[in-house]
């Protein structure tokens, strides 16, 4: 099946043609391409309206399309292997004729997530609804079809042909027929604008009654961006009608002579062009030559004009269009500069906030300020950041390094600090000794005391507590107490000896723990250290550190 009936709309510098026919997207593109065009782009709301107009024209000619929901291919496609990209307005699709991606889109529904298959876009028309400018055809994506299998509901396609410029339609001053033949092989007798290089065939007369005269014209570029037919005066003029037929073919005023002849004229402020039919404004700004928000400013004596841009924009190379000035090129900001349409804005890096002397300046955020500190203990503000610190006996913890955690000096790196028993406390530690040993004045070592199997000596008084630094006591290995039969901790049986020479073996009698002074009902389980171990720190021997035991005073203690 080929492409059948066609409709055409020309506007600006492009013509759109609509064709009915069940073709694959590739066949449709080939059809457009043979005549020098491509499947149509729909890059703006305005262009969508032009395409809608040509489709409406086609639908008026078509008796009945086979599907209520009809689809017409346009030139938006995604090649095989290119994935859907939800972050882009065109979702990873691109226009077949090339050109930049534009922000306008009108997707019918969420797109199918795929990469392998080539995907093509069609305009979805609900033929049960009138085509209204406010209800533009939606974009529907799907497989691109294949010869003989165009895809579901495909009824045709829309082509677009671009030109250097357009001629005005020829004006007839009397009965006759104009037939335009465009470079894309479409013939039409009614075009709002006629593309460059089109031919016009004018047959004057009223059919059988008069002899018909034929004229042939070509739309040419007379001067840069000036296109006309090279004809002078109205065509098919007839003394019989004078100015009464189609205003004599004149653009504005028609003046009749006594002999039935007539001339075209123009209203004040306009002048007659070389075709002796068309009027153009004497004010060069009246044709709105400036684009993109540019204002047209008349030159001296109203002869020429210049375009002026609003603040934050500058003229492009054509001197007709405004483009955004990238103010960030001049580094106006202290830290980050973000260019915006018609301006810019300054932003500050993380850890800084707007402020300080000068425009776009940034000042350090004091994260350690009162009521703002993220740190559990110490907080030091730095330029653009901060860091947390902990008091002696604590180390930084937490994923973000803002929390402080007690250092258990009894199991610390490099081995324990006590020669024998070690009691960890919040931010510190105390040493103790096994039965028969007493704590030396340094608060760390144990010396031989009177032989006894009583309880271990408790922690020293505050002034005797173990120093965190500068200890000369050898590092000892750790063996945590294990759970006894009644839930009481017991020392792991061993024949190792404390570092001070002695022949008295350490017994495996259960140890009753003394509470540290000043906290009678609360105690910490000691770690038992044997300084004779040569291998350095070892893994704890599976102790359960959350055991509650009966204290000497009969109260329940808990770690």
């Amino acid at each position: 099946t080929g492409a059948d009936t066609e409709a055409v709309v020309c506007v600006g510098t492009a013509c759109y043609t609509a064709h009915s026919g069940k073709l694959s997207a590739a066949e449709a593109q080939n059809h457009c391409n043979q005549n020098g065009g491509n499947l149509a782009t729909v890059k703006s709301k305005e262009e969508a309206q032009h395409v809608q107009r040509v489709l409406a024209q086609l639908l008026r000619r078509e008796a009945a399309l086979t599907a209520r929901m009809s689809k017409f291919w346009i030139g938006l496609q995604r090649e095989k292997g290119k994935c859907l990209d939800p972050s882009l307005p065109l979702k990873g699709f691109s226009w077949v004729g090339g050109g930049e991606d534009t922000p306008y889109s009108n997707w019918h529904k969420e797109l199918r997530n795929s990469c392998i298959s080539k995907r093509c876009v069609s305009l979805l028309l609900d033929l049960s609804q009138p085509l209204l400018p406010s209800r533009l055809p939606k974009w529907s994506e799907g497989p691109c079809g294949s010869p003989g299998s165009p895809g579901s509901n495909i009824e045709g396609f829309v082509c677009k042909f671009s030109f250097k410029g357009m001629c005005r339609p020829l004006a007839l001053g009397g009965p006759g027929q104009v037939t335009y033949t465009t470079p894309f092989q479409t013939t039409s007798s009614s075009l709002e604008a006629v593309p460059f290089a089109s031919a016009a065939n004018v047959a004057c007369g009223e059919g059988d009654k008069d002899e018909t005269q034929s004229h042939y014209f070509l739309c040419k570029e007379k001067a840069p961006d000036v296109f006309d037919w090279g004809s002078s005066g109205p065509l098919c003029v007839s003394p019989k009608y004078g100015c009464n037929f189609n205003n004599g073919g004149c653009h504005q005023d028609c003046f009749e002579g006594g002999d039935g002849s007539f001339l075209c004229g123009c209203r004040p402020g306009f002048r007659l062009l070389d075709d002796l039919v068309t009027c153009a404004s004497r004010n060069p700004c009246s044709s709105s030559p400036c684009r993109g928000g540019a204002t047209c400013v008349l030159g001296p004596h109203g002869k020429n004009y210049t375009c002026r841009c609003p603040q934050g924009y500058q003229l492009d190379s054509s001197q007709l269009d405004c483009v955004d000035v990238d103010e960030c090129q001049d580094s106006p900001c202290a830290q980050e500069c973000v260019n915006t349409p018609g301006g810019f804005r300054c932003e500050c890096w993380v850890g800084y906030e707007p402020g300080g002397p000068g425009e776009g300046a940034c000042q350090d955020v004091d994260e350690c300020a009162l009521g703002r500190s993220p740190c559990a203990q110490g907080c030091t503000n730095t330029d653009g950041s901060f860091h947390c610190s902990c008091e002696e006996g604590y180390v930084l913890a937490g994923e973000d390094g803002t929390q402080c955690q007690d250092v258990d000096e009894c199991v610390g790196p490099g081995g324990p600090l006590c020669d024998s028993l070690c009691f960890n406390t919040q931010g510190s530690f105390h040493c103790g000794c096994l039965p028969g040993w007493v704590l030396a004045p340094n608060g760390v070592s144990c010396t031989m005391g009177p032989v006894s199997l009583g309880p271990p000596s408790g922690p020293p008084d505050e002034e005797d507590k173990g120093e965190k630094e500068g200890s000369t006591v050898p590092r000892a290995a750790t063996a945590s107490p294990t759970r006894g039969p009644e839930g009481t901790p017991k020392a792991t049986p061993t024949t190792s000896r404390p570092s001070l020479s002695s022949d008295a073996p350490i017994t495996s009698a259960p140890l009753k723990m003394l509470a540290p002074s000043g906290s009678p009902g609360v105690w910490r389980e000691p770690s038992i250290h044997h300084a004779t171990a040569a291998s350095g720190p070892q893994e704890p021997a599976g102790g359960d550190s959350s055991v509650a035991t009966q204290n000497n005073d009969g109260t329940d203690g808990q770690k």
Epitope: C83, N113, I116, K118
Partner: antibody, heavy 120, light 108 residues
Framework: QVQLVQSGAEVKKPGASVKVSCKAS????????MHWVRQAPGQGLEWMGG????????AYNQNFKGRVTMTTDTSTSTAYMELRSLTSDDTAVYYC?????????????WGQGTSVTVSS | EIVLTQSPSSLSASVGDRVTITCRAS???????LHWYQQKPGKAPKLLIY???NLAFGVPSRFSGSGSGTSYTFTISSLQPEDIATYYC?????????FGSGTKLEIK
Amino acid sequence: QVQLVQSGAEVKKPGASVKVSCKASGYTFTDYEMHWVRQAPGQGLEWMGGIDPETGDTAYNQNFKGRVTMTTDTSTSTAYMELRSLTSDDTAVYYCTNYGNLYYYAMDYWGQGTSVTVSS
Amino acid sequence: EIVLTQSPSSLSASVGDRVTITCRASSSVSSSYLHWYQQKPGKAPKLLIYSTSNLAFGVPSRFSGSGSGTSYTFTISSLQPEDIATYYCQQYSGYPLTFGSGTKLEIK
């Protein structure tokens, strides 16, 4: 929820062919592409190819030099991967996988794997 | 085809450690198309991070990713025992999709 259930382990002779199936459930089968990835013992992951069940279009890794064919049966929501002219180098676990609602080929759903042993 | 080189090929770390794996591409890869997977022995790979830095559903926040162009990084902020696995990066910038060589992570 999306589930991909693969056929059982296979033992094949060199030169033979193997056809592994992957039955999908929990979504509209034609909505997502299906891909196949294999892993030889102690080795990394190797993409073999994929198929779009809506169109039947395929994309294959050229390393398989025309030995692989991927097909789908939309009536049973099943994808198939056939590998021909097997050698011992094809001994691997074969996975079917797709990217569900994620974009950019981030493979979110995986079958449990099918072990294929090629041995004489 | 784009070759992804992971380093190190294996590493041993302690529970609580910060672990970083690097994935280098033989030519530039769009950050949208770079993903990370975890594979435990005898199991199918599991998507952890998609499009360089987005956490897949149900993945703990200790996993993160960053990078652009030809250099991408995967990080575990505080290693947990259950993180013992092999980690793979994967890219797509035209067929074939390719995976990195893998990084085997062990606990000290």
